[in-house]
Interface confidence: low
């Protein structure tokens, strides 16, 4: 059964997938697809790497980590309900039927709307200007000042994203690592 990951509408979703290259720069092709992993390849490919680089991508899908070190975790930016479903991370190890296949279930929840706080200083205390998630990969930083005309719904979304990002990082810390070679 697939592992389940959650995000709210408007957030960035994180789907972890890792392997350990046999040697630095000795990369294994990887594909990400929407839908469960088929017998070969990936269906509905959203992103693909080869032995050297990312050679195919589609809008909103990022490799935020250092894929040259085997972090091929997928970030989906600004998710909608339509992004819900199973995603396949396929590590295409050379040889017949050697591929490592991971099915990850993404559940998108509607964004919560919370009532406006009564005092501005409550917001300032609760939300520092710079909010950075912890993890092995590159920092993903939400900078309130960089969001134009931020409203209270967005602030609520950021709060929930912080909570979910901590969960995501905990999952990332305990994620399986595949060693190649």
């Amino acid at each position: 059964s697939e592992v389940e990951y959650r995000a709210e509408v408007g957030q960035n979703a994180y789907l972890p997938c890792f392997y350990t290259p046999a040697a630095p720069g000795n990369l294994v092709p990887v594909c990400w697809g929407k839908g469960a992993c088929p017998v070969f390849e990936c269906g509905n490919v959203v992103l693909r790497t080869d032995e050297r680089d990312v050679n195919y991508w589609t809008s909103r899908y990022w490799l935020n980590g250092d894929f040259r070190k085997g972090d091929v975790s997928l970030t989906i930016e600004n998710v909608t309900l339509a992004d819900s479903g199973i995603y396949c991370c396929r590590i295409q190890i050379p040889g017949i039927m050697n591929d490592e296949k991971f099915n990850l279930k993404l559940v998108i929840k509607p964004a919560k709307v919370t009532p406006a706080p009564t005092r501005q200083r409550d917001f300032t205390a609760a939300f520092p200007r710079m909010l950075t998630t912890r993890g092995h990969g590159p920092a993903e930083t939400q900078t309130l000042g960089s969001l134009p005309d931020i409203n209270l719904t967005q602030i609520s979304t950021l709060a929930n994203e912080l909570r979910d990002s901590r969960l995501a990082n905990d999952l990332r810390d305990s994620g399986a690592t595949i060693r190649i070679g």
């Epitope: 960035n12 680089d53 809008s59 490799l63 935020n64 894929f67 600004n78 590159p138």
Partner: nanobody
Framework: QVQLQESGGGLVQTGDSLRLSCVVS????????MGWFRQAPGKEREFVSA????????VYADSVKGRFTISRDNAKNAVYLQMGSLKPGDTAVYYC??????????????????WGQGTQVTVSS
């Protein structure tokens, strides 16, 4: 024709700060992933930092994480790199780059279609 123009480089001492700016003209700035790369003498051009179109995702090379901060101002068609706690190893020509995508690998030079001419940053000990 998309053009990128960097500024803000110079000679500084170890531990100092510097802010680089890059202004984009001739294109729809909001559609671009913006990145900073650097190239030291005799070395390959390397990834420093990048930011997606909305500013919601930032990525840093391990060597600059915690010292450098990338930001962008879509109203001014500008991207910035605030560099702190500079070291002699940060000496390089710094390039601003734009990728007309909102996905892909932000660390790869090949992802970026548009480049500035570069600005020299020299950190003396």
């Amino acid at each position: 024709q998309v053009q990128l123009q960097e500024s803000g480089g110079g000679l500084v001492q170890t531990g100092d700060s510097l802010r680089l700016s890059c202004v984009v003209s001739g294109g729809t700035f909001r559609n671009y992933v913006m990145g900073w790369f650097r190239q030291a003498p005799g070395k390959e051009r390397e990834f420093v930092s990048a930011m997606n179109w909305s500013g919601g995702i930032t990525v840093y090379a391990d060597s600059v994480k915690g010292r450098f901060t990338i930001s962008r101002d879509n109203a001014k068609n500008a991207v910035y790199l605030q560099m702190g706690s500079l070291k002699p190893g940060d000496t390089a020509v710094y390039y601003c780059a734009a990728a007309a995508i909102d996905g892909g690998t932000v660390r790869s030079i090949n992802s970026y279609a548009y480049w500035g001419q570069g600005t020299q940053v020299t950190v003396s000990s």
